[in-house]
C-alpha cells in the first residue's frame, strides 16, 4: 500500500512539474502588421486565441520573456505571400528573411540566435507567390531574457495563424 501511495505521489509530482514547464506558441496579429521593405521587429502577436497559448512565460511589448532558467527549444515559422489582387510588387527581387533575437536586460546586449530566408525572384507574370521559412534550435536561456522576431518585407507576411508564428518550450533545467 505504501509503495502505491509513493507511486501516485511520484506521478502527481511529475505531472505538476510537467504542468509547470514553461511554453509559448504565439501567432501573428493580422490587424497590426507593420509595413515596409526593410527589417522590422514584429511586436503584435496573439498569446491566448486560436492556436496561441502561453504558460509560465510572459508576453510583453512584443517580446517573449523567459521566467525560468533552462534549456529551451525555440522555433519560428514565417510565411510570405503575394497575390496580384492586392496590386503589383514594386520590385521583383526580394530578400525574405526572419531573425530570432535574444535580448538580455541585465547585461544590455542583443544576439541573433537564428536566421533564415532567401533571396527570391517573384515575377510579375505570376498571379500568386508563396515562400515559407522555418527555423528552430536549442538554447540556454536565463530568467528575464527576451525573445523577439524581426522580418524583412512585413507587408508580404501571410497573416494566418497557421502560417506566421513562433514559440518556445523548456526542455530541461540548467544543471
Amino acid at each position: 500500500e505504501k509503495a502505491m501511495v509513493d507511486g501516485s505521489w511520484l506521478d502527481l509530482a511529475k505531472r505538476s512539474k510537467l504542468e509547470a514547464q514553461p511554453f509559448a506558441h504565439l501567432t501573428i496579429n493580422a490587424t497590426d502588421i507593420p509595413s515596409g521593405s526593410h527589417k522590422v521587429s514584429l511586436s503584435s502577436w496573439y498569446h491566448d486565441r486560436g492556436w496561441a497559448k502561453i504558460s509560465n512565460m510572459t508576453f510583453s511589448n512584443g517580446k517573449l520573456i523567459v521566467n525560468q532558467d533552462g534549456f529551451y527549444y525555440l522555433y519560428a515559422n514565417i510565411c510570405f505571400r503575394h497575390h496580384e489582387t492586392s496590386g503589383d510588387l514594386a520590385t521583383e527581387y526580394l530578400q525574405l528573411m526572419v531573425y530570432v533575437t535574444k535580448t538580455s536586460i541585465k547585461i544590455p546586449s542583443s544576439h541573433t540566435l537564428m536566421k533564415g530566408g532567401s533571396t527570391k525572384y517573384w515575377s510579375g507574370n505570376s498571379e500568386f507567390h508563396f515562400y515559407s521559412i522555418n527555423v528552430g534550435g536549442f538554447f540556454k536561456l536565463r530568467s528575464g531574457e527576451e525573445i523577439s522576431i524581426e522580418v524583412s518585407n512585413p507587408s508580404l507576411l501571410d497573416p494566418d495563424q497557421d502560417a506566421t508564428y513562433f514559440g518556445a518550450f523548456k526542455v530541461r533545467d540548467i544543471d
Epitope: S35, D88, A90
Partner: antibody, heavy 126, light 103 residues
Framework: QVQLVQSGAEVRKPGASVKVSCKAS????????IHWVRQAPGQRLEWMGW????????KFSQKFQGRITVTRDTAASTAYMELRSLRSEDTAVYYC???????????????????WGQGTLVTVSS | EIVMTQSPSSLSASVGDRVTITCRAS??????LNWYQLKPGKAPRLLIY???SLQSGVPSRFSGSGSGAEFTLTISSLQPEDIATYYC?????FGQGTKVEIK
C-alpha cells in the same frame, strides 16, 4: 500641396509618336509610383502602365507592350509617357496619376490613384 | 483578366436623393476596390479606396461598401456638385462608368 501638372494638347498623324510629361510637386517624387491612364471618347478609363519613380521599374498593359515607354527624371520630378505608332483609336485624354503607396513604407503598387494630372488631349488624325 | 461591370450606366435623381451605384467583379477581389469621380475637363478624384475607406477631403455623404465581388457606392444626399461620371476600379480594370444627372 500635391500637384501633377501635365504638358499641353498634342495633334499627331497616324504612325507618329507622342511624348506627354507629368511634373510632380508637393511630395518626394522618388517615394511613389506614377501610373498612366487614358480615356478615349465615350470609353471607360484604361490603365496603360506604371513607373516606380524611385528605381525606374516599369509595368505595362499587354495592350500597349512594345509601343509604350515610360521614363522619369528624378531631378526634375517629372515622369514621361511616350506612345509610338499612333493610330486614330489612340485619340484620348491621357492622365498621369500617383499611386497612394509610399515606397519607403512598402513594396506594393496598390493602384489607389490619390492624385491625378489635369489630362492631356492627344488627337491622332490624318 | 478581371472584368468590372457597373450598373446602372446612367441615372437621373433629384437633389437630396439617396443614390446607389453597383459594381461587380468577374471574380473575388477581397476589398481591393476604389471609386473615382470624373467631371469634364477636370482631374479625376479618388473618393473611396479599399471598398469603404473615405479619401481625405471627400464629403461624408459618399460611402462605399461590399467585399468579394459585389460593391456599392452610395451618395446619401445628392448635391448639384455631384453631377459627374463615377468609375469603380480594381488594379488595372475599370468599370464602364455611371453618369449621374439631376432631374
Amino acid at each position: 500641396q500635391v500637384q501633377l501638372v501635365q504638358s499641353g494638347a498634342e495633334v499627331r498623324k497616324p504612325g507618329a509618336s507622342v511624348k506627354v510629361s507629368c511634373k510632380a510637386s508637393g511630395y518626394d517624387f522618388s517615394n511613389y509610383a506614377i501610373h498612366w491612364v487614358r480615356q478615349a471618347p465615350g470609353q471607360r478609363l484604361e490603365w496603360m502602365g506604371w513607373i516606380n519613380a524611385g528605381n525606374g521599374n516599369t509595368k505595362f498593359s499587354q495592350k500597349f507592350q512594345g509601343r509604350i515607354t515610360v521614363t522619369r527624371d528624378t531631378a526634375a520630378s517629372t515622369a514621361y509617357m511616350e506612345l509610338r505608332s499612333l493610330r486614330s483609336e489612340d485619340t484620348a485624354v491621357y492622365y498621369c496619376a500617383r499611386d497612394s503607396e509610399n515606397m519607403v513604407r512598402g513594396i506594393i503598387i496598390a493602384y489607389y490613384f490619390d492624385y491625378w494630372g489635369q489630362g492631356t488631349l492627344v488627337t491622332v488624325s490624318s | 483578366e478581371i472584368v468590372m461591370t457597373q450598373s446602372p450606366s446612367s441615372l437621373s435623381a433629384s437633389v437630396g436623393d439617396r443614390v446607389t451605384i453597383t459594381c461587380r467583379a468577374s471574380q473575388s477581389i477581397s476589398r481591393y476596390l476604389n471609386w473615382y469621380q470624373l467631371k469634364p475637363g477636370k482631374a479625376p478624384r479618388l473618393l473611396i479606396y479599399g471598398a469603404s475607406s473615405l479619401q481625405s477631403g471627400v464629403p461624408s455623404r459618399f460611402s462605399g461598401s461590399g467585399s468579394g465581388a459585389e460593391f456599392t457606392l452610395t451618395i446619401s444626399s445628392l448635391q448639384p456638385e455631384d453631377i459627374a461620371t463615377y468609375y469603380c476600379q480594381h488594379t488595372r480594370a475599370f468599370g464602364q462608368g455611371t453618369k449621374v444627372e439631376i432631374k
